[in-house]
């Protein structure tokens, strides 16, 4: 058993039929010695008396809020949560496996630049009685500070018969140099509690590996005189690290006909303009990627040819 | 300890081309190592990230763009003195800081070159003949060093009398390649910045 936060404890259980469970001793936080009784949750049934209560925790029915009272007055609470271990593996029932970039990916994180700011998100089908808390650091043995906000519900989607909920959190490394060469990864730890079930999820990464620039901005077409051609131009996204001559981007320019069957024409360039033959109903798209360290491409910025 | 904005003459900064080749060569070699050594811990997640230049050179700090010198987190107290000549400098107006930056890059390359050559000598003794260093990568390191044109004592190639442990050598190769790729990215960013200045 260990303390998650004040008056909240996690009991780690091997989860299999007829498992013996864990013996837990609860102590009432009071100077009082006599006339103390214990109850569980909203029940008025007295579970025991005395300053300590010994219980055998085997299943979710044994978890919950234990309260010690004296003469009708509440003295203290202890909330017991269960953390299940099945076949030596901690349960991952609360969050959905996003399977990207590999199986057992529950947390996904992205950074728009090298400032040390990043966003992580996760998915669940659970809609109520759900809380998350997020901690992060750079390295684990001698951790350096990373500050995370509160996790918030950022999107809801319908997937078949199920509703899916996306939660996200923003974190910022306390003293980040955009030009630094990372040797210790960022560690992100998410504690998830659903009713009386506790689970924890972790992710470890270098900022350089989770970079995904915003799409290029101000994508514009300028028709060229006496020609079917247009000059396409765009700019670095505002959120990208500066100076741009140091943090350079590569761009992918694509021309796509109206029909998905039409072959796309595309090219990669380090410049912020190109000349395109604009066909009716075609669209021109541009996306960006760090020029020197190939992490993710940005989403496309697109304009119609017409 | 930062790069000035008004640096080389217009026209192709001679080291940019070499640094682009360097990054391409290191990335290709790392990819080859990851494929060939698929049953060894050779991915970024599996290896320990070590920097053989740590406390010996200060490339990131010496080559910091002017715009980042206001960022407290980027300013490290380490000071290192280097020789200040070199043909990539391309202009008399080049400041001492830029010379410091380029000589730091040169020292990095020299250190990695020695490590890679020592490692290659060991890999050539491996009866499995599983992996060797790409000669193109070694040549590209050499070309960039020549373009930087700094004079410094040659570091003798390390020789070892004991029987090499090929498993450990291959893991060390992965560690070295990952670290060198990260440094090659920094070098490419620096050269691009100087070329645009």
């Amino acid at each position: 058993i260990w303390e998650l936060k004040k008056d909240v404890y996690v009991v780690e259980l091997d989860w299999y039929p007829d498992a013996p469970g864990e013996m837990v001793v609860l102590t009432c936080d009071t100077p009082e010695e006599d006339g103390i009784t214990w109850t569980l949750d909203q029940s008025s049934e007295v579970l025991g008396s005395g300053k300590t209560l010994t219980i055998q925790v085997k299943e979710f029915g044994d978890a919950g809020q234990y309260t010690c009272h004296k003469g009708g007055e509440v003295l203290s609470h202890s909330l017991l949560l269960l953390h299940k271990k099945e076949d030596g593996i901690w349960s991952t029932d609360i969050l959905k496996d996003q399977k990207e970039p590999k199986n057992k990916t529950f947390l996904r994180c992205e950074a728009k630049n090298y400032s040390g700011r990043f966003t992580c998100w996760w998915l669940t089908t659970i809609s109520t009685d759900l809380t998350f808390s997020v901690k992060s650091s750079r390295g684990s043995s001698d951790p350096q500070g990373v500050t995370c906000g509160a996790a918030t519900l950022s999107a809801e989607r319908v997937r078949g018969d199920n509703k899916e909920y996306e939660y996200s959190v923003e974190c910022q490394e306390d003293s980040a140099c955009p030009a630094a060469e990372e040797s210790l990864p960022i560690e992100v730890m998410v504690d998830a509690v659903h009713k009386l079930k506790y689970e924890n999820y972790t992710s470890s990464f270098f900022i350089r590996d989770i970079i995904k620039p915003d799409p290029p901005k101000n994508l514009q077409l300028k028709p060229l005189k006496n020609s079917r051609q247009v000059e396409v131009s765009w700019e670095y996204p505002d959120t990208w690290s500066t100076p741009h001559s140091y943090f350079s981007l590569t761009f992918c320019v694509q021309v796509q006909g109206k029909s998905k069957r039409e072959k796309k024409d595309r090219v990669f360039t380090d410049k912020t303009s190109a000349t395109v033959i604009c066909r009716k109903n075609a669209s021109i798209s541009v996306r960006a990627q760090d020029r020197y360290y190939s992490s993710s491409w940005s989403e496309w910025a697109s304009v119609p040819c017409s | 300890r930062n790069l000035p904005v008004a640096t080389p003459d217009p026209g192709m900064f001679p080291c940019l081309h070499h640094s682009q080749n360097l990054l391409r060569a290191v990335s290709n070699m790392l990819q080859k190592a990851r494929q060939t050594l698929e049953f060894y811990p050779c991915t970024s997640e599996e290896i320990d990230h070590e920097d053989i230049t740590k406390d010996k050179t200060s490339t990131v700090e010496a080559c910091l763009p002017l715009e980042l010198t206001k960022n407290e987190s980027c300013l490290n107290s380490r000071e290192t003195s280097f020789i200040t000549n070199g043909s990539c400098l391309a202009s008399r107006k080049t400041s001492f800081m830029m010379a410091l930056c380029l000589s730091s890059i040169y020292e990095d390359l020299k250190m990695y070159q020695v490590e890679f050559k020592t490692m290659n000598a060991k890999l050539l003794m491996d009866p499995k003949r599983q992996i060797f260093l790409d000669q193109n990568m070694l040549a590209v390191i050499d070309e960039l060093m020549q373009a930087l044109n700094f004079n410094s004592e040659t570091v003798p190639q390390k020789s070892s009398l004991e029987e090499p442990d090929f498993y450990k050598t291959k893991i060390k190769l992965c560690i070295l390649l990952h670290a060198f790729r990260i440094r090659a990215v920094t070098i490419d960013r620096v050269m691009s910045y100087l070329n645009a200045s």
Epitope: T250, V253, R266, V267, F268, T269, T275, I277 | Q20, R24
Partner: nanobody
Amino acid sequence: EVQLVESGGGLVQAGDSLRLSCAASGRTFSTYVMGWFRQAPGKEREFVAYISTGGLISDHADSVKGRFTISRDNAKNTVYLQMNSLRPEDTAVYYCAAASRTRRPIATIKDEYDYWGQGTQVTVSS
């Protein structure tokens, strides 16, 4: 393997025009991004223009923009460089190059190109 042969170079007066051609062998021509580069004596080889595999996207170096135009004919396995308003500073050996699309090459960088022609000399006198 792609073989590239340039033609159309020569000696012209400033203000004149020239059209360079580059004929490629092989059936996979339409899977290559094509580029033109040039090298003046004692100088680095520099980017002039590129064109995408389908011929819809192109770009030119700032120094030639508005004067030179790159185009391709995939049916003829040929890429062209139309050079108008030529200047003495355009004097150089012009090279045609091919970069395999599958490698996702950055089209403005010479080292990203896999195959090169022998070059054709363009001399512009004042």
